[in-house]
């Protein structure tokens, strides 16, 4: 089953996908589509690359912000809405019969959490929830959402690596914030 990624309405969503160009610089076409990966190509294409650059996108909200030339073809969807929820297909179109790498990732878009900060809290908690947590070179991992804040570290496996997701529990306790789920 596909890996789930969570983003809040109005935030940017990050859906990871990558490959290793072999040899380096030898890029292959990639497509991102809304819906699970079909037999061929991508259906409902939202973004497509060729051997050099992005050559097709259905909206200015879809971006590849990683190092495209090193094979980082992770999709960023800006200013997400509830309608962006669903399964997305990242298809790395390696030449040859049935050689494509197909990755399904699921985006769950949630309504903004109602966060009532204590008077002493100086920073904007809206941007702290949800928060993409960067762990090393692979970029943002999964978003931690309010409503269920575990006290344990959660290990998430995706196609490429295992990422440690750390909760914001202690930070919130320190700030004195009151969390109410939407």
């Amino acid at each position: 089953s596909e890996v789930e990624y969570i983003a809040e309405v109005g935030q940017n969503a990050y859906l990871p996908c990558s490959y290793t160009p072999a040899p380096p610089g030898n890029l292959v076409p990639v497509c991102w589509g809304k819906g699970a990966c079909p037999v061929f190509d991508c259906s409902n294409v939202v973004l497509r690359t060729d051997n050099r650059d992005v050559n097709d996108r259905t909206s200015g909200r879809y971006w590849l912000k990683g190092d495209f030339h090193k094979g980082d073809v992770s999709l960023t969807i800006e200013n997400v809405t509830l309608a962006d929820s669903g399964v997305y297909c990242c298809r790395i179109q390696i030449p040859g019969i049935m050689n494509d790498e197909k990755h399904n990732v699921k985006l769950v878009v949630i309504k903004p959490a109602k966060v009532t900060p204590a008077p002493t809290l100086q920073r904007d908690l809206t941007s702290a929830f949800p928060r993409m947590l960067t762990t090393g070179e692979h970029g943002p991992a999964e978003t931690q959402t309010p409503g269920s804040l575990p006290d344990v570290n959660l290990t998430v496996s995706n196609f490429f690596c295992e990422l440690q997701i750390f909760t914001l529990t202690n930070e919130l306790r320190d700030s004195g914030a009151t969390i109410r789920t939407a």
Partner: antibody, heavy 116, light 107 residues
Framework: EVQLVESGGGLVQPGGSLRLSCAAS????????MTWVRQAPGKGLEWVAN????????YYVDSVKGRFTISRDNAKNSLYLQMNSLRAEDTAVYYC?????????WGQGTLVTVSS | EIVMTQSPATLSVSPGERATLSCRAR??????LAWYQQKPGQAPRLLIY???TRATGIPARFSGSGSGTEFTLTISSLQSEDFAVYYC?????????FGGGTKVEIK
């Protein structure tokens, strides 16, 4: 307006050959996967073969592998299906389609009859 | 090869009534499923793709639903031009396969 016009069908003896053509217009042919789907008389639909935009990848249903060859000429906006070693069970209307996974545009079809 | 099972084989409905057609598989297709309409002597016409998205120019009385292994095509109020054969087609697994069809006939 999208148009797909098949030609080349007819009556052929078992073991014989035919070449079907499909002339495309009204869309950017070179950007589109193209597909052949067939329908035996009074029967359902069967996907036969498809071909990627540049012709670099071709896929076939098992029953026609090694006998049928799909090809395209992007300069002429044309799709082809070379059918060799034809069998009675290849008798069908052959449709040309644009698309890779599902098919939004269909030609009117051309009938291939394999009979002695 | 993935077998797509459509039911019923024939559906007798009066004009203005609702028709519900079923397409089942033994495997998860997510939403990689399309529906087509075919009238005698004509090529099929795409109605629905992605299990629920209406193709261009398709009237709102046609709707698709379901995901995974069970899918439904609903025609909310049958018009005279809707009496035809309907096929589902999966595009999640190779080879692409069609269901055997459901004939919607006038009651």
């Amino acid at each position: 307006e999208v148009q797909l016009v098949e030609s080349g069908g007819g009556l052929v003896q078992p073991g014989g050959s035919l070449r079907l053509s499909c002339a495309a217009s009204g869309f950017t042919f070179s950007n589109s996967w193209m597909t052949w789907v067939r329908q035996a008389p009074g029967k359902g639909l069967e996907w036969v073969a498809n071909i990627k935009q540049a012709g670099t990848e071709k896929y076939y249903v098992d029953s026609v592998k090694g006998r049928f060859t799909i090809s395209r000429d992007n300069a002429k906006n044309s799709l082809y299906l070379q059918m060799n070693s034809l069998r009675a069970e290849d008798t069908a209307v052959y449709y040309c389609n644009s698309g890779s996974n599902y098919f939004d545009y269909w030609g009117q079809g051309t009938l291939v009859t394999v009979s002695s | 090869e993935i077998v797509m099972t459509q039911s019923p084989a024939t559906l007798s409905v009066s004009p203005g009534e609702r028709a519900t057609l079923s397409c089942r598989a033994r495997q998860n297709f997510y939403s990689n499923l399309a529906w087509y309409q075919q009238k005698p002597g004509q090529a099929p016409r795409l109605l629905i793709y992605g299990a629920s998205t209406r193709a261009t120019g398709i009237p709102a009385r046609f709707s698709g639903s379901g995901s995974g292994t069970e899918f439904t095509l609903t025609i909310s109020s049958l018009q005279s031009e809707d009496f035809a054969v309907y096929y589902c087609q999966q595009y999640n697994n190779w080879p692409l396969t069609f269901g055997g069809g459901t004939k919607v006939e006038i009651k």
